[in-house]
Interface confidence: low
Amino acid sequence: EEELQMIQPEKLLLVTVGKTATLHCTVTSLLPVGPVLWFRGVGPGRELIYNQKEGHFPRVTTVSDLTKRNNMDFSIRISSITPADVGTYYCVKFRKGSPENVEFKSGPGTEMALGAKPSAPVVLGPAARTTPEHTVSFTCESHGFSPRDITLKWFKNGNELSDFQTNVDPTGQSVAYSIRSTARVVLDPWDVRSQVICEVAHVTLQGDPLRGTANLSEAIRVPPTLEVTQQPMRVGNQVNVTCQVRKFYPQSLQLTWSENGNVCQRETASTLTENKDGTYNWTSWFLVNISDQRDDVVLTCQVKHDGQLAVSKRLALEVTVHQKDQSSDATP
């Protein structure tokens, strides 16, 4: 006859408040005849959790049909878990006796502990915008989880990042833990539409990690490039000059025209367009009056982008029969 073994496979069972916990217990033999009961704790003060024969246990259900004679699975489910339910649970075999059943063998026990889910990760970017090719830091925080073991990953547009540092606090025993991670991200010119994602995986999340995101559009400044050109056609004594401000972000931009150093209020027309990468283009047209009596005209297109130092481009118009375009490098 095979010796009866009481098998409780899980040493530790992590559960979350409000969920259902399954406590497994199987036996290797049907003998001796008698019931299997569940207790929490050991000794005379132990608490009866489930007895198929008698008592009401509204939160407890059995996994198998205990009325079947050949049943060897005495696992139970406990619903609506609360913090008061933590402890070590034992399935215990009794042999029939008179006047009472007699305890025969106990399983090794399963400790039920509360696992707390981490809070939704919060990702914070830099306080100020930075230009491409520079490195910016993003922080990710999640709190209130237990146990301490947790996995955090960073992604940029779906590509996993490797340059980050993570800390879990406190280092010792605690009811709940927090995680903080800082990732260093190199900005690319096309990152206006990019995202960084912080992904947190924890045993309580059952394989469905939590994610926090931040848009790089809030961290990046793409400075504009300027080009001033003179239109070849001339209408009477007017020449059309164009200032093209390309590939900038964010949209915040001030453009002013100067004629021979004097700021002009007039601007014939302007258009703003958005590029596929999220940056903007701004085109401004300026009509210059040219008369034979005038000296050479120097036009300046000055752009102040996102509160940064102004950049400008100059164009010299020679008032001759054959006008000649001439432009210089950008000046601060």
């Epitope: 409000g18 259902t20 009401h56 509204p58 939160r59 259900t61 059995t62 996994v63 198998s64 049909d65 205990l66 009325t67 619903s79 609506s80």
Partner: antibody, heavy 120, light 107 residues
Framework: QVQLVQSGAEVKKPGASVKVSCKAS????????ISWVRQAPGQGLEWMGW????????NYAQKLQGRVTMTTDTSTSTAYMELRSLRSDDTAVYYC?????????????WGRGTLVTVSS | DIQMTQSPSSVSASVGDRVTITCRAS??????LAWYQQKPGKAPKLLIY???NLQSGVPSRFSGSGSGTDFTLTISSLQPEDFATYYC?????????FGGGTKVEIK
């Protein structure tokens, strides 16, 4: 779709027995307990008992102990409620209801009810 | 057994009114209370579970509150389809028990 379909109306004489069926579909029958609730004409709701197909667990209202038997057939996803020694005050609509599982004991899915009339 | 007492047994109200129904348990049941709506000839319908959680598909004008022994169901703005009988039910322990019901009638 998710539903509980109950058997049709019954007319019984005092002292007889009635067996009402409740067929579940659209969900895992063994995953949820079933309760039986009755309602006498013009009266409130009265819980009769509870059965969980997974383990065959039952729990009956004290006043019906000995007269009521709840069973399940997992092969057909059907729950049964048998009430014996019928009396005129057993005349009622009998409902089966699924225990929701999202909280303690509450019922998120109900059958349409079976009218049982006990009359001589 | 835990006794559940509902009040009032009936209430007359008009469309747009705020209606409050109370339920008292004879002993503490934590938050394990549900509210149901029943229309004539129909099965009950779960509105609120665990005292304050709105069942999926139920309009947000229904809300529940309370813990321990005293509970409330509130309909913030009564609609024509809300005229029905409402029951509370304790789910803390067997036997499960229901309140006597509150009939919400058209004024």
């Amino acid at each position: 779709q998710v539903q509980l379909v109950q058997s049709g109306a019954e007319v019984k004489k005092p002292g007889a027995s009635v067996k009402v069926s409740c067929k579940a579909s659209g969900y895992t029958f063994t995953g949820y307990p079933i309760s039986w609730v009755r309602q006498a004409p013009g009266q409130g709701l009265e819980w009769m008992g509870w059965i969980y197909a997974y383990g065959g667990n039952t729990n009956y209202a004290q006043k019906l102990q000995g007269r009521v038997t709840m069973t399940t057939d997992t092969s057909t996803s059907t729950a049964y409620m048998e009430l014996r020694s019928l009396r005129s005050d057993d005349t009622a609509v009998y409902y089966c209801a699924r225990e929701a599982g999202s909280s303690w004991y509450d019922f998120d899915l109900w059958g349409r009810g079976t009218l049982v009339t006990v009359s001589s | 057994d835990i006794q559940m007492t509902q009040s009032p047994s009936s209430v007359s109200a008009s469309v747009g009114d705020r209606v409050t129904i109370t339920c008292r348990a004879s002993q503490g049941i934590s938050s394990w209370l549900a509210w149901y709506q029943q229309k004539p000839g129909k099965a009950p319908k779960l509105l609120i579970y665990a005292a304050s959680n709105l069942q999926s598909g139920v309009p947000s004008r229904f809300s529940g509150s309370g813990s321990g022994t005293d509970f409330t169901l509130t309909i913030s703005s009564l609609q024509p389809e809300d005229f029905a009988t409402y029951y509370c039910q304790q789910g803390a322990s067997f036997p499960i028990t229901f309140g006597g019901g509150t009939k919400v009638e058209i004024k």
